[in-house]
Amino acid sequence: SLGSLTIAEPAMIAECKTRTEVFEISRRLIDRTNANFLVWPPCVEVQRCSGCCNNRNVQCRPTQVQLRPVQVRKIEIVRKKPIFKKATVTLEDHLACKCETVAAARPVT
Amino acid sequence: SLGSLTIAEPAMIAECKTRTEVFEISRRLIDRTNANFLVWPPCVEVQRCSGCCNNRNVQCRPTQVQLRPVQVRKIEIVRKKPIFKKATVTLEDHLACKCETVAAARPVT
């Protein structure tokens, strides 16, 4: 909201850098047959580039990413058969970020 | 992506807590009647509740919020000339979080 001038600190730009975000696992694991009885955990932390740049024509983009496999436990019930799975979900962490022109292709390292 | 079992650590739940997020200061927040201006900074950091809970029927919600006024610069363009003004934007930081039933009304402290 916009107020009259009060004891307000100057706003600092949220610089382009990695921040901790929450990645939802369950949605990506749920199958169309709705066979999932239990998926754990439902979400995990990932590192992602966020923030803004000095110019509207550039965007905060990852310059270095790392794939991190994590183990998810899952019970599916298919035709009365409980299937106990330990599945590996590969998460993508951003390690470094940069303000890049929108047209630039995103590198994957 | 879901893969076969590799050297994967067990996935840890992203618990319900405050995390740093990026809040975009939209021009509409400053002045809805005028389009000929810029806002600086375009985005700031805020603290927000995120993560997931032990149950699908509960959500990670703030139990305590704090309003934080910050000073932004509004650069108006009048007859090709920049006019510098200061405006106050009130940001909302979440100070504490709790997994609450979805129906529960969100308290604002």
Epitope: N36, F37, L38, V39, W40, P41, P42, R73, I75, I77, K80, K81, P82, F84 | I13, C53, N54, N55, R56, N57
Partner: antibody, heavy 116, light 107 residues
């Protein structure tokens, strides 16, 4: 350490309902299911059904399908099993157990006696 | 439902004896079988999962083997504290089913 603590002994009349609670501690409650198993006096073990502590999904043994309801309350890490239309042959010790592909931790059991 | 049978229904053996219990499933259950020990007035205790995996803290004198329809549970050297009833349980299909149990006591 992992613990499942059940509610106390119940004496019920035929036709009544009973609700047994099972409070879990010492582990991440939502990461497992809770199974309910009963044992009539001097008899073997009989699986009644289970509930996913995270999303409340249930699966009941056909025998109990119409009479049992399993629920979960994650604010207190407690699972409940309600059995309706009690008959004398429902007299048994009712156990809750933490469940994955095995029942690795069990409650102490709740004796339910159905008698007129 | 998958029927589980156990034999013998009861047995008496001396301390130090090797004790073997068999469990048979009415259909192929692969290795989806657990073994439990239950002492009088107590809750069952998981001893072996996945037909042959010994649970943490369970003495090594207990072992399990088998797959498909035929399974074996062995106590290599019976101890006085092993007096209990032993149950097999399948988790291949719902509903999960238990064997009728084998009561073990000491001569």
């Amino acid at each position: 350490q992992v613990q499942l603590v059940q509610s106390g002994t119940e004496v019920k009349k035929p036709g009544a309902s009973v609700k047994v609670s099972c409070k879990a501690s010492g582990y991440t409650y939502g990461a497992y299911a809770i199974s309910w198993v009963r044992q009539a006096p001097g008899q073997g073990l009989e699986w009644m059904g289970w509930i996913s502590a995270y999303n409340g999904n249930t699966n009941y043994a056909q025998k109990f399908q119409d009479r049992v309801t399993m629920t979960t309350d994650t604010s207190t890490n407690t699972a409940y099993m309600e059995l309706r239309g009690l008959k004398s042959d429902d007299t048994a010790v009712y156990f809750c157990a933490r469940a994955w592909n095995s029942f690795d931790y069990w409650g102490q059991g709740t004796l339910v006696t159905v008698s007129s | 439902d998958i029927q589980m049978t156990q034999s013998p229904s009861s047995l008496s053996a001396s301390v130090g004896d090797r004790v073997t219990i068999t469990c048979q499933a009415s259909q192929d259950i692969r290795k989806n079988l657990n073994w439990y020990q239950q002492k009088p007035g107590k809750a069952p205790k998981l001893l072996i999962s996945d037909a042959s995996t010994l649970e943490t803290g369970v003495p090594s004198r207990f072992s399990g083997s088998g797959s498909g329809t035929d399974f074996t549970f062995t106590i290599s050297s019976l101890q006085p504290e092993d007096i209990a009833k032993y149950y097999c349980q399948q988790y291949y299909n719902l509903p999960f089913t238990f064997g009728p149990g084998t009561k073990v006591d000491i001569k």
